[in-house]
């Protein structure tokens, strides 16, 4: 059990208060974190708070500054980057969103050996990507979907591809589909790790369906905006790799990377690149029907100037149960062999774990194992790999830092975190330099988050990077809600949850029930991390219960409930969410007429699923931008989870998991629908069928639009948001405003 | 030994067409970007087009865009130049280059075209 | 287009003395772009320098290449009898690819 404490003793009880809804708007308790920009094993960057960009060397103790805020101001530069070699910074500035990852901006080359903008061969504006090569002060960048590659910054640019075109051909950035749901990057070009050759991916979207839909925006006709995205059972990109000599890019031109025959005889995706050196480099491939992935090590044939996988080098990952991996396919982290690698896939029992492949998979050598899941391999040097897991405690919610011994046989296992700061922390990520000389660690939770630097070799904490102390001064007359994570045994399946209280909880009364619900496959909701957000504020102000529920099609509690939802979405997520608020009326604090819920995209499709479930449990619930049928979402994720919508597939299921089959049963309950009008990702189309159906079926519900907002509703319209739905939850419990 | 052999050229009235060809052997074709590259009478070099590996590229001199039409077959270790609308501007010698836009490392003998009524 | 003039048009030598040979851009090149070849009479080109200082394979050190920006320059050390030809610079960095008009290097 976590317990936040509220700290509330009788002498000071006039002294605390309760949070408002007015603090989480307004970002009150918000924490920071500190990640360093590492450009050493023992040096890293870091933005001052006066906006300085400055360089620490970990070792001299020294730090100076290497761009002074002036100059960033003089371009309005909200982000840099150093060239490798030292001698460059970009600047970006006018950043301008497009969808999650995505971006255009400005930007502006500084040369710091002289002090001055470089002038001369100035870079395009906008720019989509832009990046420095690893070694020296290259610069690949993309502008109107096609790359180009700069020797010097001062240099005229050289054209590597000519045919990009707005929502047709994209090079070296990703289309809608890629970005959002395969490579989670706004980039799709990789540098080897020298900088001699840069791979690509070129998506051909010209044979994609076209979602359309207005922005209002402000002129006297709607703008159309206009995304090949390609739904359920659609049309898919045409994905190709190509990789191109950066030092004479002019003589052989970009050289396509083969696919692998047992991929390429029908619909496929590429997954992810790896470089391993700079004449060896790893793409994963995937099959359109996401079970079978294929893992394709490609050497440089300087004979041949061109690019060759032999089918000897070829690792095929297959899953029986399910889909192949977790949310992605895992990518591998290689050895010093350059030709063995660590990468995590489940085991004979269904966990996830991480293997050392050195030949086969069949052959692979599992390093981890257990009832529990290896989550991330962070870095791997000549004498130990760095990973997180959630073995601790058997807390599934919980992230920890291991250390494998690999120079020395038997190989011995550490927990790096376990026992730092074990109230305050136990949910880590890291960050390592070069060589893993020197680590960051940054803890989320469950106490107040704090950044901390560490030795490498031995593992000493050096010192605290970000503490937010302030936060905890802030927090110190904040009356905070109680928080736990417990688990429920039903049938054979494990039930986390997390349930926040109000801080002057009494087992003895009655309290209304909020459920909180993500539920999307391989997601996780039951974490050890410290937020102040609006639930908390419901806890503390409103005195209601919240709870989040990791049900059947979760993550890292092994394949069995992972997989549990395979072709079956909407199914089991909703029975799970039912199933614990039974339990948790039968724990005797919760008023059974005052049970609501309420989700966000996959969680708007689960809670409307289980406000029309017909089980009588719930008054009242929220949908914000929820998935109405799977024939509306995007293909790479729908079918990865559900096949295809077709006769021979799975079209039953996709018709019988609507949320508009079942507009009927929301006849007893007051749910609120909420959507924003320019969501690129879960279309406004999801809402607007499941309105017409509850017309049609003459129900009668309550609807909120956001004029021009994405999936994210973002800025006044968030504040709107959490407004409108806080006197819609608070009417509902019949509380006071 | 790297070989590159032009056939194709010859005398041809304005506004006719003519195909060359370029026979590669020595090397990899498939994995050779390829170009012509012309030569008028006593005059200089001229780049007339260019085409990647697999063909996915393909890029023309403006004064040929829209009449030349430059392909390869890798499985004939073959490149090709449909020369359609000939003018009298076209007559020169044709090379055949390895290489893509520059570097051009290897070159054929060259194969005369005329245009002349 | 990128063009490229070279100068001189026609340089008359000895074996034996050096020559230079100049190339200027009408806009700037990366090195890496600009090429150096030899042509006989008769005879097809022959690549000389890539990367604009970097001898093909085969090519004798007497050729040396060097500049940067838009002025390019191909230096011949000692003029042996085989190399009086007509000399192109070609950059690859922009599309379409352009040559020089050549200079000759003739014999004196």
């Known amino acids: 059990i976590v317990l936040r404490p509220s700290r509330v003793h009788n002498s000071e009880e006039n002294t605390m208060r309760a949070l408002t809804l007015k603090d989480i708007l307004n970002g009150t308790f918000s924490y920071k974190t500190f990640f360093p920009n590492w450009i050493s094993g023992q040096e890293y960057l870091h933005q001052s708070a006066d906006n300085n960009i400055v360089l620490y060397n970990i070792e001299t103790g020294q730090s100076y500054t290497i761009l002074s805020n002036r100059t960033m101001k003089s371009v309005n530069a909200s982000n840099y980057g150093l060239s490798p070699d030292r001698q460059f910074v970009y600047l970006e500035s006018d950043y301008s969103k497009l969808w999650r990852y995505s971006y255009t901006a400005t930007y502006y080359i500084y040369d710091l050996s002289n002090g001055e903008f470089v002038r001369g061969n100035e870079l395009p504006r906008p720019i989509q990507y832009l990046c420095w090569s690893p070694v020296g002060s290259k610069l690949a960048y993309v502008y109107q979907n096609n790359i180009y590659l700069k020797q010097r910054p001062g240099d005229p640019p050289f054209q590597i591809t000519f045919n990009g075109r707005e929502n047709k051909i994209f090079n070296g950035i990703p289309d809608w589909v890629y970005e959002e749901e395969m490579l989670a990057t706004k980039y799709a070009l990789w540098w080897s790790p020298n900088g001699k050759f840069l791979a690509y991916a070129e998506f051909n979207d010209t044979d994609i369906p076209v979602i359309a839909y207005s922005y209002y925006g402000d002129e006297q006709y709607p703008r159309t905006i206009n995304i090949p995205y390609p739904k359920a059972g659609a049309k898919n990109p045409v994905v190709r790799i190509f990789i191109i000599d950066t030092t004479y890019p002019a003589y052989v031109g970009p050289q396509e990377v083969p696919v692998p025959a047992m991929i390429a005889s029908s619909d496929y995706y590429f997954s992810w690149l790896t470089w391993v050196t700079d004449e060896r480099v790893c793409l994963q491939w995937l099959k359109r029907v996401q079970n079978v992935s294929v893992l394709s090590i490609c050497d440089f044939r300087e004979d041949w100037q061109t690019w060759d996988c032999p089918k000897t080098q070829e690792h095929i990952e297959e899953s029986r149960t399910g889909w192949a991996g977790g949310f992605f396919v895992s990518t591998p982290v290689f050895s010093y062999d350059a030709i063995s690698y660590y990468k995590i896939f489940s085991d004979k029992d269904g966990y996830k774990h991480i293997h050392y492949i050195k030949d086969t998979v069949e052959n692979a050598i599992q390093i981890t194992s257990g009832k529990w899941e290896a989550i991330n391999i962070f870095r791997v040097t000549q004498d130990s790999l760095f990973y997180s897991s959630n073995e601790f405690e058997e807390y599934p919610g919980r992230r920890n830092i291991y250390r494998i011994s690999i120079g020395s046989y038997p190989p011995s296992k550490k927990c790096v975190t376990c026992h730092l700061r074990k109230e305050r922390c136990q949910y880590y990520t890291a960050s390592f330099s070069d060589y893993a000389k020197y680590y960051a660690l940054v803890c989320y939770g469950p106490g107040i988050p704090i950044s901390t630097l560490h030795d490498g070799r031995t593992d000493q904490e050096i010192k605290i990077l970000e503490e937010n102390k302030e936060l905890e001064n802030a927090l110190k007359n904040i009356q905070l809600p109680k928080e736990e994570i417990k688990k429920l045994e039903v049938d054979e399946i494990t039930l986390w949850y997390k349930m926040i209280l109000p801080p002057q909880f009494d087992r003895s009364k009655k309290y209304p029930l909020l459920i909180q619900v993500y539920g999307g496959p391989c997601s996780q909701s039951v974490r050890s991390v410290f937020a102040v957000n609006w639930i908390s504020y419901l806890a503390s102000k409103e005195g209601m219960v919240i709870a989040l529920v990791d049900g059947r099609g979760t993550a890292f509690q092994g394949d069995k409930l992972l997989y549990a939802v395979y072709r079956k979405l909407g199914v089991y997520e909703v029975e799970d969410q039912i199933t614990a608020v039974r339990k948790f009326i039968e724990m005797g604090f919760i008023d059974e007429k005052r049970i609501a819920i309420w989700g966000w995209s996959y969680g708007g499709y689960v809670s409307s699923l289980a406000l029309a479930s017909g089980t009588g449990l719930f008054k009242c619930g929220i949908a914000v931008a929820p998935v109405s049928s799977w024939e509306y979402y995007a293909s790479v994720y729908t079918e990865r989870f559900m096949g295809l919508p077709t006769k021979d597939d799975n079209l039953e299921h996709y018709k019988n998991s609507t949320v508009m089959a079942r507009a009927e049963y929301f006849r007893n309950v007051d749910y609120l629908l909420i959507h924003g009008t320019a969501d690129d990702n879960v279309h406004f189309q999801n809402s607007a069928q499941i309105a017409k159906a509850l017309v049609n079926a003459q129900v009668d519900f309550q609807a909120m639009w956001y004029s021009d907002q994405n999936h994210g509703l973002s800025g006044l319209s968030t504040n709107h948001l959490y407004t409108h739905m806080t006197h819609f939850l608070k009417q509902c419990f019949s509380l006071s405003d | 030994e790297v070989q590159l052999l032009e056939s194709g050229g010859g005398l041809v009235q304005p506004g006719g067409s003519l195909r060359l060809s370029c026979a590669a052997s020595?090397?990899?074709?498939?994995?050779?970007?390829m170009s012509w590259v012309r030569q008028a009478p006593g005059k200089g070099l001229e780049w007339v087009s260019a085409i990647s590996t697999n063909g996915n590229y393909t890029y023309y001199a403006d004064s040929v865009k829209g009449r030349f039409t430059i392909s390869r077959d890798n499985s004939k270790n073959t490149l090709y130049l449909q020369m359609n609308s000939l003018r009298a501007e076209d007559t020169a010698v044709y090379y055949c280059a390895k290489g893509w836009l520059g570097n051009f490392d290897y070159w054929g003998q060259g194969t005369l075209v005329t245009v002349s009524s | 287009e990128i063009v490229l003039t070279q100068s001189p048009g026609t340089l008359s030598l000895s074996p034996g003395e050096r020559a230079t040979l100049s190339c200027r851009a009408s806009?700037?090149?990366?090195?890496?772009?600009l090429a150096w070849y030899q042509q006989k009479p008769g005879q097809a080109p022959r690549l000389l320098i890539i990367?604009?200082?970097t001898r093909a394979t085969g090519i004798p050190d007497r050729f040396s290449g060097s500049g940067s920006g838009t002025d390019f320059t191909l230096t011949i050390s000692r003029l042996e009898p085989e190399d009086f030809a007509v000399y192109y610079c070609?950059?690859?960095?922009?599309?379409?690819?352009?040559f020089g008009q050549g200079t000759k290097v003739e014999i004196k």
């Open positions: 806009q700037s090149v990366s090195r890496s772009y």
């Open positions: 070609q950059q690859g960095q922009v599309i379409p690819p352009t």
């Open positions: 020595g090397f990899t074709f498939s994995s050779s970007a």
């Open positions: 990367g604009a200082s």
